[in-house]
Amino acid sequence: GITNINCSGHIWVEPATIFKMGMNISIYCQAAIKNCQPRKLHFYKNGIKERFQITRINKTTARLWYKNFLEPHASMYCTAECPKHFQETLICGKDISSGYPPDIPDEVTCVIYEYSGNMTCTWNAGKLTYIDTKYVVHVKSLETEEEQQYLTSSYINISTDSLQGGKKYLVWVQAANALGMEESKQLQIHLDDIVIPSAAVISRAETINATVPKTIIYWDSQTTIEKVSCEMRYKATTNQTWNVKEFDTNFTYVQQSEFYLEPNIKYVFQVRCQETGKRYWQPWSSLFFHKTPETVPQVTSKAFQHDTWNSGLTVASISTGHLTSDNRGDIG
């Protein structure tokens, strides 16, 4: 950076090198060049010479004034015009930054994704600060009072093996940067209450062409949690509103859910689950598409590997991978 150059004098910023965005700031340059009484002092911002708001303070010092400085980062340097020197002589340089103090972190959430071995904590950091902002996640046992702190710049994964102070904890987040420090409210958690079951996945769908055509959705999860509540939402791809069906589920076998749908329409399905009575849901599963047959069964679009079985009596769709969910982060 600009701060690594050899200086023949010095440059400083008031009120500080890192300051609140929108402030008025002054940049001072003081020359200390051998055998040079500077004729003129020049300021450069990001390599471009500044023309206005420069005041000569004395023989060796000048000030550059900025009103309402809004740039997150800038490289400043200053030079001197010395008699008998053809080129300007570099005095010194400095990187400056503007931004905001952190907001109070809120919406602190900690979950344990089944089989992950981690407790994942996230929060709403608030408005963009533009400057380096660090977060310290505090985890304090309600049983032993032992506290652990984790430094991060975003979310944090904490190994559940390191949580040795029992099952009950307080979690809070401290945000700090050069302009200020704020702290969230404390979140009380019980490790058994924040587990999110292993992801539920829709594996295939088939429409049976009975008197009233019936679509069966096959879905499963590797969870070992006994009491699981799930929601499946579905809609025609042309619709805005979802229909939601609720299930109390036992994943000892593949789930089969029946739907009576309109013929010759492309539908999209998603599923999510939670441990019954607990707070947090899985994110919605990947989008699963299925096109119902016309009254006479037909093969559906190859793009989603739809196949036809049972001598024309069924139309089936197989999941081929992961199209992202429209709100994959929904754990509330």
Partner: antibody, heavy 121, light 112 residues
Framework: EVQLVESGGGLVQPGGSLRLSCAAS?????????MCWVRQAPGKGLEWVSC?????????YYANWAKGRFTISRDNSKNTLYLQMNSLRAEDTAVYYC????????????WGQGTLVTVSS | DIVMTQSPLSLPVTPGEPASISCQAS??????LAWYLQKPGQSPQLLIY???KLAAGVPDRFSGSGSGTDFTLKISRVEAEDVGVYYC??????????????FGQGTKVEIK
């Protein structure tokens, strides 16, 4: 058994500086721990000054009135806690105690004997 | 800022009789409260932590109770050696940007 021994107290003029030390033994400096400074003005109650948390990173905490004037630090190689006190005032006259439980809790099983700081002209 | 308020500030006691000191926090501190006794000319010593747990070597005539904002230290039968100043301390968190003190003002216990 944890032992804490403070030193560095004495008479200092208003506006002056002083650095207090607390030599600790019996603490596992490789684990997470809090170490703190607490002071007591003559005839007054206990007043929290500052704490340092040492774990995978180091974090420092100060009473509102101590921010900007006092700095807590530690030297693990010397098993020593420090309190650098600048811009001292007459109201900073007190016995300064070093305190810890030797772990990452904020109650104090162990206290030093205290070191007296007198700020006077 | 969490403020700790003790009452009474002075407590004359009769040896053999029970005594009780109250400590109130200005916000929820769960069970994160400690009690100390400072005998004349000595450093403070920990009596109770986590609101109700007896520190090592402390006689069982001392007991603590409470959670949230209201806490009590009880001495079942006061002895002459129990005189001194008792302090409560919140041990919840010191990372809050606006903490002035974490101790109560102290309760002076003396023999009648």
């Amino acid at each position: 058994e944890v032992q804490l021994v403070e030193s560095g107290g004495g008479l200092v003029q208003p506006g002056g500086s002083l650095r207090l030390s607390c030599a600790a033994s019996g603490i596992d400096f490789n684990s997470n721990y809090y170490m703190c400074w607490v002071r007591q003005a003559p005839g007054k109650g206990l007043e929290w000054v500052s704490c340092i948390y040492v774990g995978s990173h180091v974090n420092t905490y100060y009473a509102n009135w101590a921010k900007g004037r006092f700095t807590i630090s530690r030297d693990n190689s010397k098993n020593t806690l420090y309190l650098q006190m600048n811009s001292l005032r007459a109201e900073d006259t007190a016995v300064y105690y070093c305190a810890t439980s030797g772990s990452s809790v904020l109650y104090f099983k162990f206290w030093g004997q205290g070191t007296l700081v007198t700020v006077s002209s | 800022d969490i403020v700790m308020t003790q009452s009474p500030l002075s407590l004359p006691v009769t040896p053999g009789e029970p005594a009780s000191i109250s400590c109130q926090a200005s916000e929820n501190i769960y069970s994160f409260l400690a009690w100390y006794l400072q005998k004349p000319g000595q450093s403070p010593q920990l009596l109770i932590y986590s609101a109700s747990k007896l520190a090592a070597g402390v006689p069982d005539r001392f007991s603590g109770s409470g959670s949230g904002t209201d806490f009590t230290l009880k001495i079942s039968r006061v002895e002459a050696e129990d005189v001194g100043v008792y302090y409560c301390q919140q041990t919840n968190r010191y990372s809050n940007p606006d903490i002035y003190n974490v101790f109560g003002q102290g309760t002076k216990v003396e023999i009648k």
